[in-house]
Amino acid sequence: HAPEDPSDLLQHVKFQSSNFENILTWDSGPEGTPDTVYSIEYKTYGERDWVAKKGCQRITRKSCNLTVETGNLTELYYARVTAVSAGGRSATKMTDRFSSLQHTTLKPPDVTCISKVRSIQMIVHPTPTPIRAGDGHRLTLEDIFHDLFYHLELQVNRTYQMHLGGKQREYEFFGLTPDTEFLGTIMICVPTWAKESAPYMCRVKTLPDRTWT
């Protein structure tokens, strides 16, 4: 028989999305056991029928990768999990409506920090996503978010930071003291979607000035 409360078997059914990799996750409820099995279905908002996700039927793990199935940036999606206990009890729970554009979080960028004598150069590498363009290429975050820009900060000392920002991929902080250590932080920002990545950090030391030796 079905439990009084589905939460007894199944809790916290939600999408966890980072850089457009969309993973459905859930927790077992207080009456869930290690041999409880889970089956996953998904559908596009506006569609009537649910589609069973191959590879996520009668599984015991508590996650399912729906990146491919939810890969259209302009669509909204739902997913649902059905839990069946060893004793035959079942419960089904559905996610909130999911939009990858709205809900995905941004990982720190991939950056190369290069030391020079009186400057530090930072080269941001475009972040690939799992989403494929019509030509088969993987889209980068820059392809998806028009308003994406990079915010760079260089901690010079306890009280002074230098800032740079923009949509370029190459930046350089000038006027630095040779043979000195600096802490750089670089974040991805998308203001129109209120997104800000965790920072990439690099600790770099300017090169010694050999011209006086």
Epitope: L73, I131, A133, G134, D135, H137, L139, D143, I144, H146, D147, F149, H151, H163, L164, G165, G166, K167, Q168, R169, E170, P191, T192
Partner: antibody, heavy 117, light 107 residues
């Protein structure tokens, strides 16, 4: 050398349609943000629409939504602007522009669109 | 939409004068600001990006400053070729918006 060459402008009656083209060369067209920007006679500049040539993502200024459609033919390195239900206030020089290395630094010479009866 | 308010709308300058044009954003745009120069019948030409960084090939008499909501373009020692209309552009969020323009004429 980056080159952008617009065409397709002309005189059209209110309510009519026009399709602008922008032939691009000298850069990786199939992985860029491309823009249409207009300038009404004696007035300032206004961004009309943008498209990412790889993802196909588009944005429009509010005043043209539902009337204008931006698109590309990546095989021919060409940007388009389909303009329907034209109004007199759409009269302007239309420029195409592109963002390269983060900067909107390359513009075409423009094509004149006149909406008048 | 972010509004960009430019002032003055026009100004007269003698050759060699120093000229300052202001641009105010309706919200914080950090340093996401371009300055362009436009001559009649020509497309805009990029002078400054990132509020203060000089575009390659642009003479050093042009300089930009500011961040947040207040920005300035300065021409130190106006030359004949600088008589044109100047626009600021916010590159922070779509729709990208220009200031109304400042026409610099000869006194």
């Amino acid at each position: 050398e980056v080159q952008l060459v617009e065409s397709g402008g002309g005189l059209v009656q209110p309510g009519g349609s026009l399709r602008l083209s922008c032939a691009a060369s000298g850069f990786t067209f199939s992985s860029s943000w491309m823009y249409w920007v207009r300038q009404a006679p004696g007035k300032g500049l206004e961004f009309v629409s943008v498209i990412n040539t790889r993802s196909g993502i588009t944005h429009y200024v509010e005043s043209v939504k539902g009337r204008f459609t931006i698109s590309t033919d990546n095989a021919k390195n060409t940007l388009f602007l389909q303009m329907n239900s034209l109004k007199s206030e759409d009269t302007a020089v239309y420029y195409c522009a592109t963002r390269i290395q983060g900067l909107i630094d390359y513009w075409g010479q423009g094509t004149q669109v006149t909406v008048s009866s | 939409d972010i509004q960009m308010t430019q002032s003055p709308s026009s100004m007269s300058a003698s050759l060699g004068d120093s000229v300052t044009i202001s641009c105010q954003a309706s919200e914080n745009i950090g340093t996401q600001l371009f300055w362009y120069q436009q001559n009649a019948g020509q497309p805009p030409k990029l002078l400054i990006y990132g509020a203060s960084r000089l575009q390659t090939g642009v003479p050093s008499r042009f300089s930009g400053s500011g961040s947040g909501t207040t920005f300035t373009l300065t021409i130190s020692g106006v030359e004949t070729g600088d008589l044109a209309t100047y626009y600021c552009l916010q590159d922070y969020s779509w729709p990208l918006t220009f200031g109304q323009g400042t026409k610099v004429e000869l006194k």
